[in-house]
């Protein structure tokens, strides 16, 4: 029978299928930076090249040297999960092992950097097919380790990292916190976050998605035919590295941005019980469990988007938060969220030639998040149109005035500090299709894009009675690109996108003093790409 | 994901006291020193010196050599363990933490990070 983890990540229609590149050979190479490995195990024999790379600190004590098989345990198991004959995700994939962890599973940032540099050198000396680097390790936040991952990713290498097993915010660890890395948390057979003793999987905005990481059966280094089960975010990352290897075997030209977007888009949604995570992390943590996506040929030119949260701005009066998309992605909208509701809105600005999403804290606020909607829009030409705040009592309108440009998102930013004197912005699709509409003291920003066949529409949902949140979803075939909250009067916490759902949040205390006439409205901008069609606004 | 997390950054912007030697013109450090927030994971005595992105190959070697020379003048021996050329410009050194102020004032230095442990997950 198929082990639960493989059943979970490989849909039935993929089970028997062998992934091969168009020319018939599987050219993907996976580099594993881990302990030494037992290359003679039946699961991985003939698939693994054990490089002579070795950069590890000395072990504490000597007991490990006696039983060398224990030194190989972690790496052998992961190699088996990636490409094992029986229990592997990407059964045909060739794997190169670099030893950066000692017999006790400890390594150093410097050793890992030298390992990453070794891969880069190998790539320069002998260019090959697609490369996937598996980093089943974690240390404290390291600017240089993250920078090295960024540099390697920009050469076309796909890096997959363990989120960490500290039951903590993955952003506090490296390489998990590197944006250019696909960071993987761990779930169990019930699709719940993995608990490991008193700790467990890391979580938060730096995690891209989760994958099986509890009681995973794989190669044991103790004998050539032994299997053992291991748990952790390393195992989860190995599953995703295997999925990525299979995706690249079929379609070697997929970029990191495309791989990440497809992994997110085709993952299993909303099965994780978010109550396991700390309350302040629940909104930031993706409710996604990895599955092997179909090929792009089977799914057509879908518009793919993901939500990127910024770090928390901090509570100072002028604190700003910044969310960035990957270089290949288009920032189609920007919104903001504050748990206290004290925020001065959000806007898009260009920094160093890249559009970024900014959010501003308000006086007395505990801080804000900027929430970027990052999408893959082939041949897109996007621009931002903004209008300064209107005089008191007047509305501010911004629309996309360039021919064939469609509105993909709206942002609003208030100049005034005093939240009580202003009414919040509104986005009116019925009266003014394709326009962002703001109220007193709000600067309004419209994100306008032109791309072949891109069409968009606004979808609103309002609730008059007391409600902590209002949601509106884009229907099948449409992708959420923009999400805003349009309140009647009271304080809103902001809005953000969860997959294809626009969530508008209202302050708890605001519920009681809201009259039935003051509906809180969640407004979504839904877009789709129809390559044959002209860019258009759908009424 | 790119903001610095729970991370120690120390500005060691000490005014130069470089004995007035010709190649050690007054230079105030703008580079920063960083280390892991978890003390037990730190590896004091080993440092990754990260240079500005556009630093040329020869300049990396010169900077490492300059640090060795300046350290030697002060009676310290430092060991350059590795030079990074391909992913980023920099070098790995084993040296006394006493020399961090000196290292941060070297030209081309963007920041210095103390080495730290990583763990199998």
């Amino acid at each position: 029978s198929i082990p639960w983890n493989l059943e979970r990540i490989i849909p039935a229609w993929h089970q028997t299928e062998e992934d091969r590149s168009p020319d018939g050979s599987s050219q993907v190479e996976v580099y594993l930076l881990d302990t030494s490995i037992q290359g003679a195990h039946r699961e991985i024999e003939g698939r693994v090249t054990i490089t002579d790379f070795n950069s590890v600190p000395e072990e504490d004590g000597t007991r490990f040297h006696r039983q060398a098989s224990k030194c190989d345990s972690h790496g052998t198991h992961l190699a088996g999960v990636v490409s094992g004959r029986d229990a592997g995700v990407a059964k045909g994939t060739s794997l190169h092992s670099l030893r950066v962890l000692n017999c006790q599973g400890k390594g150093t940032v410097s050793g890992t950097l030298i390992g990453l540099e070794f891969i880069r050198k190998s790539q320069l000396i002998q260019p090959s097919g697609p490369l996937v680097v598996l980093l089943p390790l974690a240390g404290g936040y390291s600017r240089i380790l993250n920078a090295a991952c960024r540099h390697l990713a920009r050469t076309g290498v796909v890096l997959v990292a363990a989120a960490g097993n500290f039951r903590d915010d993955a952003c506090l660890y490296s390489p998990a916190s590197a944006p250019e890395v696909i960071t993987v948390g761990a779930t169990n057979a019930q699709d719940q976050p993995v608990t490991l003793g008193t700790l467990g999987t890391n979580f938060g905005r730096c995690v891209d998605l989760f994958a099986p990481g509890k009681d995973i059966i794989g190669a044991s280094s103790d004998c050539s035919t032994c299997f053992m089960s291991q748990s952790g975010t390393s195992q989860a990352a190995a599953h995703v590295a295997g999925i990525v290897a299979r995706m690249l075997s079929r379609e070697p030209t997929l970029t990191l941005a495309e791989l990440r977007q497809r992994l997110i888009h085709f993952s299993t949604k909303d099965v994780i019980n978010m109550a396991w995570f700390p309350e302040d992390q629940q909104v930031l943590t993706p409710n996604l469990v990895a599955t092997l996506p179909p090929s792009t040929h089977e799914t057509g030119g879908q518009l793919l988007c993901r939500t990127v949260w910024s770090a928390h701005s901090g509570p100072t009066r002028t604190a700003t938060a910044t969310a960035r998309c990957a270089p290949e992605e288009e920032l189609l909208s920007c919104s903001s969220f504050s748990r206290s509701g004290r925020r001065r809105g959000d806007w898009i600005e260009a920094i160093g030639g890249q559009q970024v999403c900014k959010a501003l804290n308000a006086f007395g606020g505990e801080g804000v998040y900027a929430v970027a909607r990052c999408c893959l829009v082939p041949r897109a030409n996007c621009s931002i149109h903004n209008t300064p705040a209107a005089r008191a009592g007047l509305e501010t309108h911004v629309h996309c005035h360039q021919k064939d440009h469609v509105l993909t998102g709206c942002s609003f930013h208030w100049e005034v500090e005093d939240l009580s004197v202003r009414r919040q912005p509104a986005l009116r699709s019925r009266r003014q299709p394709g326009q962002c509409v703001g109220h007193q003291a709000a600067s309004v920003y419209a994100s306008c894009c032109h791309a072949p066949g891109l069409e968009c529409k606004i979808k609103e949902h309002g609730i008059s009675g007391p409600s902590e949140q209002v949601t509106v979803a884009c229907e099948a075939g449409w992708t959420l690109t923009g999400c805003n909250v349009l309140p009647g009067a009271s304080l809103t916490l902001g809005a953000y996108s969860v997959d294809n759902l626009c969530v508008a949040r209202v302050h708890d205390t605001a519920r009681a003093d809201r009259t039935s006439g003051e509906a809180t409205v969640a407004a979504a901008i839904c877009c789709r790409s129809r390559p044959s069609a002209k860019a258009s606004w759908v009424q | 994901q790119d903001e610095d997390g729970d991370y120690e950054e120390l500005m060691l912007a000490l005014p130069s006291q470089e004995d007035g030697l010709a190649d050690e013109a007054a230079h105030v450090a703008t580079a920063t020193f960083r280390r892991c927030s978890k003390e037990a994971w730190r590896l004091p005595g080993t440092y990754i010196v990260v240079l500005m992105e556009e630093t040329q190959r020869l300049q990396i070697e010169q900077t490492a050599h300059r640090l060795q020379t300046r350290a030697a003048r002060r009676g310290y021996v430092i060991k350059v363990l590795h030079i990074f050329y391909d992913l980023f410009p920099g070098f790995l050194v084993k040296m006394s933490s006493d020399l961090l102020g000196l290292a941060l004032k070297l030209p081309h230095v963007e920041y210095i990070e103390e080495d730290s442990f990583v763990f199998a997950q």
Epitope: Q38, A40, R66, A68, D222, C223, S224, C226, M228 | -
Partner: antibody, heavy 111, light 106 residues
Framework: QVQLKQSGPSLVQPSQSLSITCTVS????????VHWVRQSPGKGLEWLGV???????DYNAAFMSRLSITKDNSKSQVFFKMNSLQADDTAIYYC?????WGQGTLVTVSA | DIQMTQSPSSLSASLGDKVTITCKAS??????IDWYQHKPGKGPRLLIH???TLQPGIPSRFSGSGSGRDYSFSISNLEPEDIATYYC????????FGGGTKLEIK
């Protein structure tokens, strides 16, 4: 397929030595260690010693003085030698590596 | 040296029953424990490796669990072919076998 084949049964005189050869196939002795275990009549399994993949050895303290394990990697053979056998050393001797075991060698110590 | 105390030393059960055998180590063995089935005239057969991993070809009625010093092995829905002697072995530090449990059918 992994196999460990042991040399045939032997009758050993008291105070004499015992030699058993374990020939492995399906894996390399440079990759995995080989353990030796015995079962005396009516008793349980007893670990005797091991030769690790690198060639180093560890022995059960009770047998240390009279046991020697060596190997020839190129021939995929492990050699087990025990000296000064007594009647209570009568047992089935196995070479093993966790999942894969030899068929056993029956050793009888008798005058 | 690590000692392994296995209990019971013998066990009689009916077909279809669930039986459990325990092994206690003299110190923490970090889950490095195997469980073997041994039948007369044959070499021991590895059932479970590293505390709980069922080896390929072994029926799912066999299971293992534990951590630290305490480990257990169970057979649910006992079948006639399960008559054998069962051993635990720690391999955290070299190998040490438990005394064995002889399983008989009532």
């Amino acid at each position: 397929q992994v196999q460990l084949k042991q040399s045939g049964p032997s009758l050993v005189q008291p105070s004499q030595s015992l030699s058993i050869t374990c020939t492995v196939s399906g894996f390399s002795l440079t990759s995995y260690g080989v353990h030796w275990v015995r079962q005396s009549p009516g008793k349980g399994l007893e670990w005797l010693g091991v030769i690790w993949r690198g060639g180093s050895t560890d022995y059960n303290a009770a047998f240390m003085s009279r046991l020697s394990i060596t190997k020839d990697n190129s021939k995929s053979q492990v050699f087990f030698k025990m000296n000064s056998l007594q009647a209570d050393d009568t047992a089935i001797y196995y070479c093993a590596n966790h999942r894969d075991w030899g068929q056993g060698t029956l050793v009888t110590v008798s005058a | 040296d690590i000692q392994m105390t296995q209990s019971p030393s013998s066990l009689s059960a009916s077909l279809g029953d669930k039986v459990t055998i325990t092994c206690k180590a003299s110190q923490d063995i970090n889950k490095y424990i195997d469980w073997y089935q041994h039948k007369p005239g044959k070499g021991p057969r590895l059932l479970i490796h590293y505390t709980s991993t069922l080896q390929p070809g072994i029926p799912s009625r066999f299971s293992g669990s534990g951590s630290g010093r305490d480990y257990s092995f169970s057979i649910s829905n006992l079948e006639p072919e399960d008559i054998a002697t069962y051993y635990c072995v720690q391999y955290d530090d070299l190998w040490t076998f438990g005394g064995g449990t002889k399983l008989e059918i009532k």
